[in-house]
Amino acid sequence: ECVTQLLKDTCFEGGDITTVFTPSAKYCQVVCTYHPRCLLFTFTAESPSEDPTRWFTCVLKDSVTETLPRVNRTAAISGYSFKQCSHQISACNKDIYVDLDMKGINYNSSVAKSAQECQERCTDDVHCHFFTYATRQFPSLEHRNICLLKHTQTGTPTRITKLDKVVSGFSLKSCALSNLACIRDIFPNTVFADSNIDSVMAPDAFVCGRICTHHPGCLFFTFFSQEWPKESQRNLCLLKTSESGLPSTRIKKSKALSGFSLQSCRHSIPVFCHSSFYHDTDFLGEELDIVAAKSHEACQKLCTNAVRCQFFTYTPAQASCNEGKGKCYLKLSSNGSPTKILHGRGGISGYTLRLCKMDNECTTKIKPRIVGGTASVRGEWPWQVTLHTTSPTQRHLCGGSIIGNQWILTAAHCFYGVESPKILRVYSGILNQSEIKEDTSFFGVQEIIIHDQYKMAESGYDIALLKLETTVNYTDSQRPICLPSKGDRNVIYTDCWVTGWGYRKLRDKIQNTLQKAKIPLVTNEECQKRYRGHKITHKMICAGYREGGKDACKGDSGGPLSCKHNEVWHLVGITSWGEGCAQRERPGVYTNVVEYVDWILEKTQAV
């Protein structure tokens, strides 16, 4: 059962796994959630009645019964991990802690104008987990405005002490705010020969890469496949680091694969969710339970629903045995990975899907599309919404994209003549406009947030957010699209589609069925040549065929330019402007979403 509230002046007795230091009980709960075994925690707040060496301790706990006896203790705050909850979870922590010094290895010291600048520096430094900044009121003159970047083995402070006139905080890498490169490639036949910080067992290089991503010290990895000559090292995932942040030596070795932490890509690809099944593979670990199950899918469901289960092995039923049910072995380990992986025994193994809620919902695979044709099918573009105005009469106004359970991203120019959000309606999961009747459910709009610098579409900043009055429950027909990672600025997208109910030619009407068109991206240099009277800025992105013929048009405005990359759809552009529609050598111009990720996150994550 999901318990989110914190229990004041309460301590859980026993069940200790480990002790870490966190600046708040709230963050202790996050740390517990991300720990492979932690189900409960007790945090000690600063208090005159408590020994200062125990202040800010966060004791992570586990229990077979999922609960522990409660004891009254002043300054203790206890609670449960969010593992038991179904809601989306994020490790993003933007809080700044005043008068706290978070201890760690101080590996970089520099002058910064503000705590915000120090935090940005930490976010864009590959090693940095957290920082402490001495303000200009700090007593020691030579330490004023000093920004200390810190890291530790666990990613959390080794101690936290009170210190006047300093502030501390965490890297915002987990908030998708890092400008560090996102390197998704996995390099075959390669070993990175740098120091190992940890090693775990993994069924393939992809799982190894995801484990590296959420390991605080891992910057890159090497994985030895099951064909690796040395038997004792097969399926071994080596988590690595180096001072420079890059591998110092690459050795060519067959049957080994290497890659990088996906730290800077984590909001646009799954890093926690290991959803594949591994056939003829057995995962070894501590046995939690053995249950009868009809299939390996059913076994995975059982593991996902058992909060302590981390991975499983399913052995299919022997002919007509046990009503055709096989055995489902629910397992766990100290680090969430199998202690050993065996092949050739006929088992089917996999991981709990409980961790998938730690990934962005937008990374979920959607059902395969029907390629060709211009009319879309239901569920093909589940992030696409139709924005209606009810004044003077109800009509389709613009397209938009679901980017969060309360947020639609669209174009600023859509709001010409819109006096208030009260006249707007957002319809999701719609294929045909004719489906929209009086009684069709819609989302009301609580707030329209237009970019401050928007003046006209041609001069850029053509971007707006709609905050919905109620939250969107994600289903197959309505779910979010990923924002591009800032680390992906150099990715060349080759599979881009524009969608909408807009005109099919310049003099036309709104279409009934959602239309789609595959359109190639055009470089900004090329686009600038086609629009000599305009300034095509880096905050714009263009798409179109040289000969014309396929393009967005009136009514498609605000809708997505969606590009598929590494099996995940990204919102690369927002339909903004263009000279006519589908004209030769006149590409469509879109708002370049990656350039507004900071703005989007600032607005959507504002308290």
């Epitope: 174009a411 600023a412 120019h413 709001f415 010409y416 003549g417 819109v418 006096e419 329209i448 237009i450 401050d452 610098q453 928007y454 003046k455 006209m456 579409a457 041609e458 053509d462 807009g502 048009c553 009136k554 009514g555 405005s557 903004s576 402007w577 263009g578 000279e579 111009v589």
Partner: antibody
Framework: QVTLKESGPVLVKPTETLTLTCTVS????????LHWIRQPPGKALEWMGL???????SYNSRLKSRLTISRDTSKSQVVLTMTNMDPVDTATYYC????????????WGQGTLVTVSS | DVVLTQTPLSLSVTPGQPASISCRSS???????????LEWYLQKPGQSPQLLIY???NRFSGVPDRFSGSGSGTDFTLKISRVEAEDLGVYYC?????????FGQGTKLEIK
């Protein structure tokens, strides 16, 4: 509720500089765009310029060399300054606010008549 | 700059009869973003102007449905299906597609 009120001198001598203030309430100048529009007696409306919500300005090209629009957000005021006034500049001066975008004009001040005469 | 030319400059209409005002632009007012930033305002005697129509044909809330707007590109029309006594005043078209923005010279509607 939303209000806009123009204030300033009713009489200005030729060659002098006109300074008009538009004081707003019920909204923030950093959230909406504010325009100045004038109307000589018995004549048509003329768009003069605007203060965008991000602090940028746009001007009527005919008046650009003589016109400055500025603002003081803490006082909720937008100021129009027009140099080298001439009798042909005698008009009712309005400030007006756009909707979500720069236009259409949803709210207008009541206007202030400025006469240019020696 | 865009010049908006309104015709006629004045018209006198019997209550209950229709009225039509034309507004012609020196350049197309279709914006590259798909919107046409053409608006109609009515200034009643002794009052500030009030919005009637935006985006060529969208009636602003509270505006009676006897008012309608149409047109595209450079030619636009405001129609009043049945003129009422309260409709007297000066009608202005206004464009915000091209910077600087401009008003038409106005059309005075009198009631016979």
């Amino acid at each position: 509720q939303v209000t806009l009120k123009e204030s300033g001198p009713v009489l200005v001598k030729p060659t002098e500089t006109l300074t008009l203030t538009c004081t707003v309430s019920g909204f923030s100048l950093t959230s909406y765009h504010l325009h100045w529009i004038r109307q000589p007696p018995g004549k048509a409306l003329e768009w003069m310029g605007l203060m965008w919500r991000d602090g940028d300005t746009s001007y009527n090209s005919r008046l650009k060399s003589r016109l400055t629009i500025s603002r003081d957000t803490s006082k909720s005021q937008v100021v129009l300054t027009m140099t080298n006034m001439d009798p042909v500049d005698t008009a009712t001066y309005y400030c007006a606010r756009g909707m979500t975008l720069a236009t259409p004009f949803l709210y207008w001040g009541q206007g202030t008549l400025v006469t240019v005469s020696s | 700059d865009v010049v908006l030319t309104q015709t006629p400059l004045s018209l006198s209409v019997t209550p209950g009869q229709p009225a039509s005002i034309s507004c012609r632009s020196s350049q197309s007012l279709e914006s590259s973003d798909g919107n046409t930033y053409l608006e109609w305002y009515l200034q009643k005697p002794g009052q500030s102007p009030q919005l009637l129509i935006y985006g060529v044909s969208n009636r602003f809330s509270g505006v009676p449905d006897r008012f309608s707007g149409s047109g595209s590109g450079t030619d636009f029309t405001l129609k009043i299906s049945r003129v009422e006594a309260e409709d007297l005043g000066v009608y202005y078209c206004f464009q915000a597609t091209r910077d600087p923005f401009t008003f038409g010279q106005g059309t005075k509607l009198e009631i016979k």
